[in-house]
């Protein structure tokens, strides 16, 4: 019996087609992805093949103005239109709190939404009961397939799930559900979830009875043969893991942003054992036409976005200096504003020991593309912020050793004075440079804001300590020459859309007046 698994993950609000790098589509003839194009390909496969499942491994939420405006209603609407068979909850599905998940998505989705390792407690337990499930058994042709979901246990540190959801260890939570499915006579089981490729592989190895793992969170690109675009494969598709009980378990992921449609064919014997698996992600480029009815629907939903982008988010009573003459040479107040917003967006998990789990931000000055003039009645709009942060990136959470941070700050000024983009703006950090010294030895003082303290204060950076830092995904991926971050980071979790982080902060503060205050000397 042959099953075709079509899968997406980390789509992050890319409902419209995008450019090759998943930013805003400029030249339509070279654009990719989007739900209209995805629908064309899915329908083509559904017509050609008998047993097809369309699955999403989480993080549909967060990433473009679509999510900012529609807050998840767009996800439910278009996933329903594409007739997804199941979705796993990702960490970003909690970005607007549990209510922001329940109302727009859980109550509106016509497909099961899954996670076995999220347990509700207290008053939320009855409110959310039945709206998401640990597993679902789906009829596929004359057979049935069990889908069991999982979500990163780090979600409380990455999003806003509140205090009434407990995120258990994935493997511990999955095993009893898989055992139950097996005992219920379900002999073909897919683990669908959002914890990253390393955890996906562990699940394949450790959870008895899982036949296939369809993952997300780490934006992993797997491919067999010559890759069709810019993404470099992290391994073959499918990636085969030998389980502890000796089975060959295929593990797949389909990069991110709806650029690819994962396509995996699995052959099962009559006892539900995997005999063979093969496939590849399908690049959703312009050779695949956009479905006209879905495209028309997208255009209808688009209208509200255009109206939103000119509405006032808040006011500034000072000039927001985002000029390259400032932000690439010295502390600039636009950099301070953005870093403050980045930290504010990550305020969660205070306890007796920690006032917050992260206090530090770094931001490449070259990523700040425009100032905002306060003389336009002080008004700040989404449109203004899109000029400041035009690349459609995310502000991510990483864990780095102090020694790596020191290298990053040396890199920040290694060729100071040439208006290059690597000069770092900061938050929760005080740095002193001596530019008379030779490159690689210019950082003379580097103090960082404590987190394990009731009164935050600045302490000298410790080389062997592990720190959490918020930074643009561009830096996490080694951009602007920050190869040491990419090579030495100990953990990387993708965060929220950059413009959304700043716009939310400005809306919250209502009136802003960021200063230059001696963070960089």
């Amino acid at each position: 019996w042959e099953l075709t698994i079509l899968h997406t993950n980390d789509v992050h609000s890319r409902l419209e087609q995008t450019s090759e790098d998943s930013s805003k589509c400029v030249n339509a003839s070279r654009c990719m992805g989007g739900v209209a194009r995805l629908f064309t390909k899915v329908q083509q496969i559904r017509r050609a093949e008998p047993n097809v499942l369309l699955l999403d491994a989480g993080d549909q939420y967060q990433g473009t103005i679509w999510f900012t405006v529609y807050k998840g209603a767009e996800v439910a609407h278009f996933m329903n239109a594409l007739r997804y068979d199941a979705m796993a909850l990702g960490n970003h599905e909690f970005d607007n709190g549990v209510e922001g998940l329940i109302e727009p998505l859980l109550k509106e989705a016509k497909f099961p939404i899954l996670s076995a390792n999220i347990k509700a407690k207290g008053p939320l337990a009855s409110q959310i009961s039945g709206l998401y499930l640990p597993y679902k058994v789906l009829p596929v042709g004359d057979e049935v397939v069990g889908i069991v979901g999982y979500t990163s246990k780090e979600t409380p540190f990455l999003s806003n799930p509140g205090t009434n959801l407990v995120f258990e260890d994935e493997i511990t939570a999955l095993q009893p559900e898989v055992d139950k499915l097996k005992t219920l006579n379900v002999n073909k089981i897919i683990a669908l979830g959002h914890s990253g490729f390393e955890t996906d592989k562990l699940i394949a190895q450790k959870v008895r009875g899982v036949d296939v793992v369809v993952g997300g969170h780490s934006n992993t690109f797997l491919y067999t043969g010559n890759p069709p675009s810019k993404e470099v494969p992290a391994g073959k598709y499918p990636f085969i893991v030998t389980s502890d009980d000796g089975r060959k378990v295929p593990v797949v992921q389909a990069y991110a942003f709806g650029k690819y449609l994962g396509y995996l064919k699995i052959e099962f014997d009559e006892r539900g054992n995997v005999i063979s698996s093969h496939g590849n992600p399908i690049l959703l480029n312009s050779s695949i036409p956009e479905d006209p009815s879905i495209k028309a629907d997208i255009n209808k939903w688009r209208i509200k976005l255009d109206n939103y982008s000119t509405q006032e988010l808040g006011k500034t009573i000072v000039y927001l200096d985002g000029s390259s003459q400032s932000c690439r040479f010295r502390e600039c107040n636009m950099g301070n504003l953005i870093c403050d917003a980045m930290i504010n967006n990550n305020l969660r998990h205070a306890d007796e020991m920690f006032w917050n789990h992260v206090s530090m931000c770094i931001l490449n000055g070259g990523g700040i593309r425009s100032p905002i003039d306060e003389r336009n009645n002080g008004t700040i709009t989404w449109e203004n912020l899109a000029a400041v942060l035009p690349f459609g990136g995310t502000f991510d959470l990483v864990q780095l050793k102090g020694s790596t941070l020191k290298k990053a700050f040396e890199h920040s000024v290694h060729r100071y004075g040439q208006s290059t983009g690597e000069f770092l703006q900061v938050g929760g950090i005080h740095v002193v440079y001596d530019l008379s010294r030779k490159p690689g030895d210019r950082v003379v003082k580097l103090d960082v804001l404590c987190t394990k303290c009731r009164v935050p204060s600045y302490d000298p950076l410790k080389m062997d300590e592990i720190y959490k830092v918020i930074l643009p995904n561009f830096l996490a991926n080694g951009g602007d020459g920050f190869q040491m971050i990419k090579d030495e980071l100990l953990r990387h979790d993708s965060g929220d859309q950059d413009i959304n982080v700043v716009s939310t902060y400005i809306s919250k503060m209502k009136v802003i007046y960021p200063a230059v205050e001696g963070r960089i000397k």
Epitope: G130, K136, P139, V144, D179, N185
Partner: antibody, heavy 120, light 107 residues
Framework: EVQLLESGGGVVQPGRSLRLSCAAS????????MHWVRQAPGKGLEWVAV????????YYADSVKGRFTISRDNSKNTLYLQMNSLRAEDTAVYYC?????????????WGQGTMVTVSS | DIQLTQSPSSVSASVGDRVTITCRAS??????LAWYQQKPGKAPKLLIY???SLQSGVPSRFSGSGSGTDFTLTISSLQPEDFATYYC?????????FGGGTKVEIK
């Protein structure tokens, strides 16, 4: 012929134990999850317990949890139900049933039943 | 636990009549419902599995329908041997549960 044959029923005092057996024939026993279902006199059907094909995973009705243990010996094609701390409300005809080969579980083969009476 | 409510609890009918029995689940169980027939002193017999699939050897006058929470067993033309008690059963989750039964009696 596909067949299930229960044995071991009888009259027993409250608080005592009893072990039921179910001998299977005519099919590959170790391919199937096996169940016990009971029926109190004049009442409806009540599912009691299940054991998976390998004998690893077991699930019980709340009414018997901690008192009854389901087990199987695939080499002998036999299913068991060890019943401890018996109560008057456990009085019923006990059926062993095959859970079918596919999902959803539907009991496609039943034994003829064995009567258990718990009485002082 | 998933509760199954059968109605009616009993029905009087004549040979040749069309008889409909309903089963309502306390939560969504997709199509994972079975129907059984039981005659006095006998073990139950499987009629329908997966809400609408007829078990082999069962006459085609028996049919099942429904999904989610509402299910129906229909006997299109009642025969003398059909007078019995009928049970629904869910297998969406453990514990497996049965409906309370519907007794079909001769009018």
């Amino acid at each position: 012929e596909v067949q299930l044959l229960e044995s071991g029923g009888g009259v027993v005092q409250p608080g005592r134990s009893l072990r039921l057996s179910c001998a299977a024939s005519g099919f590959t026993f170790n391919f199937y999850g096996m169940h016990w279902v009971r029926q109190a006199p004049g009442k409806g059907l009540e599912w009691v317990a299940v054991i998976n094909d390998e004998g690893i995973n077991k699930y019980y009705a709340d009414s018997v949890k901690g008192r009854f243990t389901i087990s199987r010996d695939n080499s002998k094609n036999t299913l068991y139900l060890q019943m401890n701390s018996l109560r008057a409300e456990d009085t019923a005809v006990y059926y062993c049933a095959r859970g079918g080969a596919r999902y959803p579980i539907a009991f496609d083969i039943w034994g003829q039943g064995t009567m258990v009476t718990v009485s002082s | 636990d998933i509760q199954l409510t059968q109605s009616p609890s009993s029905v009087s009918a004549s040979v040749g009549d069309r008889v409909t029995i309903t089963c309502r689940a306390s939560q969504d169980i997709s199509s994972w419902l079975a129907w059984y027939q039981q005659k006095p002193g006998k073990a139950p017999k499987l009629l329908i599995y997966a809400a609408s699939s007829l078990q082999s050897g069962v006459p085609s006058r028996f049919s099942g329908s429904g999904s989610g929470t509402d299910f129906t067993l229909t006997i299109s033309s009642l025969q003398p041997e059909d007078f019995a008690t009928y049970y629904c059963q869910q297998a969406n989750d453990f514990p497996i549960t049965f409906g309370g039964g519907t007794k079909v009696e001769i009018k």
